[in-house]
């Protein structure tokens, strides 16, 4: 996160860290807890690393430096990448992770509400992006979970800023004209959440941007409302019933 500040304990209890353990262990992506056994993240996090057993998912944490060999983590039972995601495109950058064991909810570890299907009418004015990603383009992973308040921009405006890419209706963009605040490398898969009528909702999944926090280059997020049918279908068909936070 560029231009952000430290988060507090329990402030974003749905935020998880997706880490890979090969020879060393490192944070690669963020994700959002949406049910006892489900995490929503970006499909591109798994490019080149599709093996379930190399991943460790840490929930209910604030500081990555607090993680030791004794820190509990979740393992992956199943990775469900959107069937239309292609490595040659930037579309459908969404994936579900089914955890091997359900998580208990606590003050520091609980799910985020999902939006209603095809939610286009709600005007979100209080949106935040969180993650442990770089604090500048050529930076490094941060220890303390960062947060930043960023306004949504219209898809029309976003398309003007990204003429060489196709900004679809299944994407949502956020950023300041002058730049300075944005997600960055390592924040991928994490949440863009907006507070509406006193309730936090998962509006976007951190996907991509041209650099980080550059002027007139907003961040681009997968629009969760556009994938509600897919999320419900995959979580229900796998569980028999949807064990996740119901759409708001």
């Amino acid at each position: 996160i560029v231009g952000g500040t430290n988060s507090s304990w329990g402030e974003w209890p749905w935020q998880v860290s997706l880490q890979v353990k090969l020879t060393a262990q490192r944070h690669l992506c963020g994700g959002s807890l949406i049910g006892h056994q489900w995490v929503l993240t970006a499909a591109h996090c798994f490019d080149g690393l599709p093996l379930q057993d190399v991943w460790r998912i840490y929930s209910g944490i604030l500081n990555l430096s607090d993680i030791t060999k004794d820190t509990p983590f979740s393992q992956i039972k199943e990775i469900i990448i959107h069937q239309n995601y292609k490595v040659s495109e930037g579309n459908h950058d969404i994936a579900l992770i089914k955890l091997q064991a359900p998580l208990n909810y606590t003050e520091f570890q609980k799910p985020i509400c999902l939006p209603s299907k095809g939610d286009t009418s709600t005007i979100y004015t209080n949106c935040w992006v969180t993650g442990w990603g770089f604090s500048k383009e050529k930076g490094e992973i941060q220890n303390i979970l960062q947060k930043v308040n960023i306004p949504l921009v219209t898809n029309e405006e976003c398309q003007k800023r990204y003429q060489d890419y196709k900004i679809t209706q299944r994407m949502v963009c956020a950023g300041y004209k002058e730049g300075g605040k944005d997600a960055c490398k390592g924040d991928s898969g994490g949440p863009l959440v907006c507070k509406h009528n006193g309730m936090w909702r998962l509006v976007g999944i951190t996907s991509w941007g041209e650099g980080c926090a550059r002027r007139e280059q907003p961040g681009v997020y997968t629009k969760v409302a556009e994938y509600m049918d897919w999320i419900l279908e995959k979580t229900q068909s796998s569980d028999g019933k949807a064990q996740m936070q119901s759409p708001a």
Epitope: A42, V87, N91, Q163, D164, S188, W208
Partner: antibody
Framework: EVQLLESGGGLVQPGGSLRLSCAAS????????MTWVRQAPGKGLEWVSY????????IYADSVKGRFTISRDNSKNTLYLQMNSLRAEDTAVYYC??????????????????WGQGTLVTVSS | DIQMTQSPGTLSLSPGERATLSCRTS???????LAWYQQTPGQAPRLLIY???SRATGIPDRFSGTGYGTDFTLTISRLEPEDYGTYYC?????????FGQGTRVEIK
């Protein structure tokens, strides 16, 4: 299956014009950046031009700027290259190609992932 | 413009040998925009590696790419008969997009 089929090449005199077409199929054409790359006989690859998915943004190599125009018709899944004021040094096989733009670590990637078989343009008197 | 310099110009190797091809750029190139292509006579180029190190769909794992900044490498761990041809590196980090002059891999 992705297919790119160029047409319109041939022999033309210096100063003449030619219009190349590229019919695309097997993918959502309107979502992709498209490009033309050429290769003079026995030489290496040279990028010519690209066009944004909507067609609203075009970039050219200095060697063709002001003479060549790239365009597209997304309703017909077709890419074009209008070549005017042709010179002997424009003699080459012209490839129509698709630009893949994936995502890696919150950035986009870019590479030319699908190529047509090429059409030969010969500029000679 | 970003100049791409490939070396060697020609590489003469036997099947089963390891091939190491170099690509140097005149300016910093974002790795996400560095690709390698293979071309055999009379054929269109074929994408091998994108993002400096990711194999394109269907490309065997004997092909690998590494590098950062201005120095990139394509390695073919064990040459197969179908690997002979000309290899090009290319950057699309900045316009104009540029290709290297190519490295020809020939049978020894």
């Amino acid at each position: 299956e992705v297919q790119l089929l160029e047409s319109g090449g041939g022999l033309v005199q210096p100063g003449g014009s030619l219009r190349l077409s590229c019919a695309a199929s097997g993918f959502t054409f309107s979502h992709y950046l498209m490009t033309w790359v050429r290769q003079a006989p026995g030489k290496g690859l040279e990028w010519v031009s690209y066009i944004s998915p909507s067609g609203g943004h075009t970039i050219y190599a200095d060697s063709v700027k002001g003479r060549f125009t790239i365009s597209r018709d997304n309703s017909k899944n077709t890419l074009y290259l209008q070549m005017n004021s042709l010179r002997a040094e424009d003699t080459a096989v012209y490839y129509c190609a698709r630009v893949a733009q994936g995502i890696a670590a919150r950035s986009r990637t870019s590479s030319v992932d699908q190529w047509g078989q090429g059409t030969l343009v010969t500029v000679s008197s | 413009d970003i100049q791409m310099t490939q070396s060697p110009g020609t590489l003469s190797l036997s099947p089963g040998e390891r091939a190491t091809l170099s690509c140097r750029t005149s300016q910093f190139v974002n790795s996400n925009y560095l690709a390698w292509y293979q071309q055999t006579p009379g054929q269109a180029p074929r994408l091998l590696i994108y993002g400096a190190s990711s194999r394109a769909t269907g490309i065997p794992d004997r092909f690998s790419g590494t590098g950062y900044g201005t120095d990139f490498t394509l390695t073919i761990s064990r040459l197969e008969p179908e690997d002979y041809g000309t290899y090009y590196c290319q950057q699309s980090s900045r316009t104009p997009w540029t290709f290297g002059q190519g490295t020809r891999v020939e049978i020894k």
